[in-house]
Interface confidence: low
């Protein structure tokens, strides 16, 4: 007998073809021999089965000898062997209806686990294979678990249920609640305005919660809270802001913070946390601030950086249009008795300039 797989909530068409392409008597019955539908004269008649209000047939194809049964809004319990009786012959079709649902809300925080549960008819032994938007493959039986969701898991998951060499495909939209970036670094010269942006990797109609930016300044012995804020329907309201530095916060998404000026005492790293209402756990984004200062004091030209820099970064002092350069994989470089002219302080990573500050050295007579 033929096996057909269906999806819970979907529509399935069970085909039954007569050898002669003409309208003739036919009946569809279930395994208990209860009539579901058939033809009487020129009219479609329905029997006393549970399917009567959801079963139909394509009348337009009867003349071609096609006597299919369409079942709408499939339920798991519709799984059965259906018999089509036409031209004194019986055709059996086994229908197996499966459902695949996420155990929890499909909006999950990064790091949380996702469980997909397969509903299947008794006696079936299906296998499930799911593919994430990022190409991750996960296999399972009645349940599939993804222990730690990552931001790249956001999107449509495609799951294939296999039974008796037949397959049916489910698509489940998963939204991973996370910031677009796990970490970002801002490089600024001393005195420049600093803009921190925390774009979210998802959109929700109503977005409510509270957040806080904790900051560990490189020079400070302990971290402190720079700002706490509430988020209500995508509107941001500051709860408390530290007096120094006086951060400003945008009132709309994406979350946006402005530090009036970059100063060495602010250089360091922060952690912005966002607790979403009705979600346990928090979204996190790390942000780093590196501040550069170039100074000339008496016969010494110094360039310094503060903040989290990797050991492979190079700090250089070079005289514009001249070959004079001093470079170090350190947080400070200096030149004694520098030549007059425009000097450049450069912080670079494998030749890529991350931060640059110019200082004019005037001749001393």
């Amino acid at each position: 007998k033929k096996v057909v797989l269906g999806k819970k909530g979907d529509t399935v068409e069970l085909t039954c073809n007569a050898s002669q392409k003409k309208n003739t008597q036919f009946h569809w019955k279930n395994s208990n021999q209860i009539k579901i539908l058939g033809i009487q004269g020129l009219f479609l008649t329905k029997g006393p089965s549970k399917l009567s209000d959801r079963a139909d047939s394509r009348k337009s194809l009867w003349d071609q000898g096609c006597f299919s049964m369409i079942i709408k809004n499939l339920k798991i319990e519709d799984s059965d062997t259906y018999i089509c009786e036409v031209e004194n012959k019986k055709e059996e079709v086994e229908l197996l209806v499966f459902g695949l649902t996420a155990n929890s809300d499909t909006h999950l925080l990064e790091g949380q686990s996702l469980t997909l549960t397969l509903e299947s008819p008794p006696g079936s032994s299906p296998s499930v294979k799911c593919r994430s938007p990022g190409g991750k493959n996960i296999q399972g039986g009645r349940t599939i678990s993804v222990p730690q969701l990552e931001r790249q898991d956001s999107g449509t998951w495609t799951c294939t249920v296999s039974q008796d060499q037949k397959t049916v495909e489910f698509k489940i939209d998963i939204v991973v609640l996370a910031f677009q970036k796990a970490s970002s670094t801002v490089y600024k010269k001393e005195g420049e305005q600093v803009e921190f942006s925390f774009p979210l990797a998802f959109t929700l109609e109503k977005l409510t919660g509270s957040g806080e930016l904790w900051w560990q300044a490189e020079r400070a012995s302990s971290s402190k809270s720079w700002i706490t804020f509430d988020l209500k329907n995508k509107e941001v309201s500051v709860k408390r802001v530290t007096q120094d530095p006086k951060l400003q916060m945008g009132k709309k998404l994406p979350l946006h913070l402005t530090l009036p000026q970059a100063l060495p005492q602010y250089a360091g790293s922060g952690n912005l946390t966002l607790a979403l209402e009705a979600k346990t756990g928090k979204l996190h984004q790390e942000v780093n601030l590196v501040v550069m200062r170039a100074t000339q004091f008496q016969e010494n030209l110094t360039c310094e950086v503060w903040g989290p820099t990797s050991p492979k970064l190079t700090l250089s002092l070079k005289l514009e249009n001249k070959g004079a350069t001093v470079s170090k994989q350190a947080k400070a470089v200096w030149v004694l008795n520098p030549e007059a002219g425009m000097w450049q302080c450069l912080l670079s990573d494998s030749g890529q300039v991350l931060l640059e500050s110019n200082i004019k050295v005037v001749p001393t007579w």
Epitope: T208, E212, S225, T228, D230, K232, S237, K239, A275, E277
Partner: antibody
């Protein structure tokens, strides 16, 4: 709807201790800083203390600093105020209050619990 | 701690009167101030936040103004249900501090 219910008030002798509780419902407790505010009989309102949503920060009025301790158990949706070395001037109705979602105003209040310090 | 000085401590007024209550901070608190109404035996009720913003559900006869150190709560036309005690609260710094209160009584 947002509800805050204080309990634990009563009569206590000077120098003794008392612990007040504030049980929250109708909102996601873990997201909110909660305050204690008190009012002596026939007197005005006095802000006492606040604890941040995650318990990380606490501030106190000078009048209670070193004697009162605020804490919370987010798993129980409960706020506590441990009051030690109680004095007659601590006699008051104690309210717990929550800030509004949109602003720093104290928009939600409990019904209050009376603490009487008397020998 | 920031001191909040509220005046008057009490006033008598009639229904329909315009009532003004002032609050002075001992230092600049920008607009970080709220106004509260309290009726006997009840918890306070937030009327105004951030000096001049009407809290949701509060009648529009209530208004607030001021910034820095001087703030005003105005009831444009006093209603019977407005007879109560009013407090200002600074939320600029911790510890937060209330004004001493103003009792609005029926004349």
């Amino acid at each position: 709807q947002v509800q805050l219910v204080e309990s634990g008030g009563g009569v206590v002798q000077p120098g003794r201790s008392l612990r007040l509780s504030c049980t929250a419902s109708g909102f996601n407790f873990i997201n909110y800083g909660i305050h204690w505010v008190r009012q002596a009989p026939g007197k005005g309102l006095e802000w006492v203390t606040i604890i941040w949503y995650d318990g990380s920060k606490k501030y106190y009025a000078d009048s209670v600093k070193g004697r009162f301790a605020i804490s919370r158990d987010n798993s129980k949706n409960t706020l506590y105020l441990q009051m030690n070395s109680l004095r007659a001037e601590d006699t008051a109705v104690y309210y717990c209050a929550r800030e509004d979602d949109w602003n720093d105003g104290l928009a939600y209040w409990g019904q209050g619990t009376l603490v009487t310090v008397s020998s | 701690a920031i001191q909040m000085t509220q005046s008057p401590s009490s006033l008598s007024a009639s229904v329909g009167d315009r009532v003004t209550i002032t609050c002075r901070a001992s230092q600049d608190i920008r607009n970080d101030l709220g106004w509260y109404q309290q009726k006997p035996g009840k918890a306070p009720n937030l009327l105004i936040y951030a000096a001049s913003n009407l809290q949701s559900g509060v009648p529009s006869r209530f208004s607030g103004s001021g910034s820095g150190t001087d703030f005003t709560l105005t009831i444009s036309s006093l209603q019977p249900e407005d007879f109560a005690t009013y407090y200002c609260l600074q939320d600029s710094n911790y510890p937060r501090t209330f004004g001493q209160g103003t009792k609005v009584e029926i004349k």
